[in-house]
Amino acid sequence: DAEQKACPPGKEPYKVDEDLIFYQNWELEACVDGTMLARQMDLVNEIPFTYEQLSIFKHKLDKTYPQGYPESLIQQLGHFFRYVSPEDIHQWNVTSPDTVKTLLKVSKGQKMNAQAIALVACYLRGGGQLDEDMVKALGDIPLSYLCDFSPQDLHSVPSSVMWLVGPQDLDKCSQRHLGLLYQKACSAFQNVSGLEYFEKIKTFLGGASVKDLRALSQHNVSMDIATFKRLQVDSLVGLSVAEVQKLLGPNIVDLKTEEDKSPVRDWLFRQHQKDLDRLGLGLQGGIPNGYLVLDFNVREAFS
């Protein structure tokens, strides 16, 4: 309805100024031009427009740039970034790290995690690098956002960022993400030795292959049961009882409390009961003695 009204004579603004705060909403709709707003974003931020008025301005900009805002405008957004949705941001093309850092500052403490993550993802998609400065600019946002990036975006995250990742950050990661992050972590921690290496890499072990876990079992790491439970089932079931015993060390006793839960249960199902009995923990669920295991998981040659 407001769209239908014409701009009253003499009300057409040639610049963004304080007079606009006294315009009725329908007048803003009828009179204000999106390209003028884009050119004078600094003034839009400076003048005390109401949220309602800024929403009208946003609607104007969205109509002017239906394919997403140009980078020249994104660089000038300032506080106006707070009115932009993650969906809007996904349409953008951002190549300047300074633009990203500036907007991350604006979003800090504003319950804008989704926008901040979308902005960084968009920057990575354009070939940008997520450096440690940027991770610091993301501030208190848990690094679980790494799991929101596409696998392609993850490739451009430098290995050094892995030093900042905590155990809870990867809880919602897909198996594919975990695999990629594990590779990055291996490269980040390659110069760390012994137990310190294990302490760093254990956060990422959900992405480790059976081969990696076998290698780890040779190093007396005494993995705790919480880390063991985070290992991917496909890797775990390939380990023998002896290898798991080496991997867990004295923590092997904790398998008993987890024997009816995945992934421990899945691993037990693939072990011979006689091997489990040798542990002396009373673990049940293994392959009964004298049974032959046939693997029907043979891939067909033609599909």
Epitope: P48, T50, R82
Partner: nanobody, 115 residues
Framework: EVQLVESGGGLVQAGESLRLSCAVS????????MGWHRQDPGKERELVAT???????YYANFVKGRFTISRDNAKNTVYLQMNSLKPEDTGVYYC?????????WGQGTQVTVSS
């Protein structure tokens, strides 16, 4: 969340004065600026005056020189001092706080100026 409660409205003669108060509570730190708006029956709400966090003030042409907006940070209150009132100043006056990501409004206080 920000809560706003207006007071000070009433019935006065043309030429007299009134002072409206707006008591602010809640997440005050999130407020960017505040304003007084008025609404006549059947009309769109219009801005009368605005004050920013640093104290810069803005006035609509129809109240310039007669109305003054001010704030008392210690009391978390914004005022609108209205002098030389005219019958056309009659309406419901609303206090508004702009924060991220919304505008918060009070319930309004009626001002009636009789000739």
């Amino acid at each position: 969340e920000v809560q706003l409660v207006e007071s000070g409205g009433g019935l006065v003669q043309a030429g007299e004065s009134l002072r409206l108060s707006c008591a602010v509570s809640g997440n005050i730190g999130s407020i960017r600026h505040m304003g007084w708006h008025r609404q006549d029956p059947g009309k769109e709400r219009e801005l009368v005056a605005t004050i920013t966090t640093v104290g810069t003030t803005y006035y609509a042409n129809f109240v310039k020189g007669r109305f003054t907006i001010s704030r008392d940070n210690a009391k978390n209150t914004v005022y609108l001092q209205m002098n030389s009132l005219k019958p056309e100043d009659t309406g419901v006056y609303y206090c508004r706080a702009t924060a991220h990501p919304t505008d918060y409004w009070g319930q309004g206080t009626q001002v009636t100026v009789s000739s």
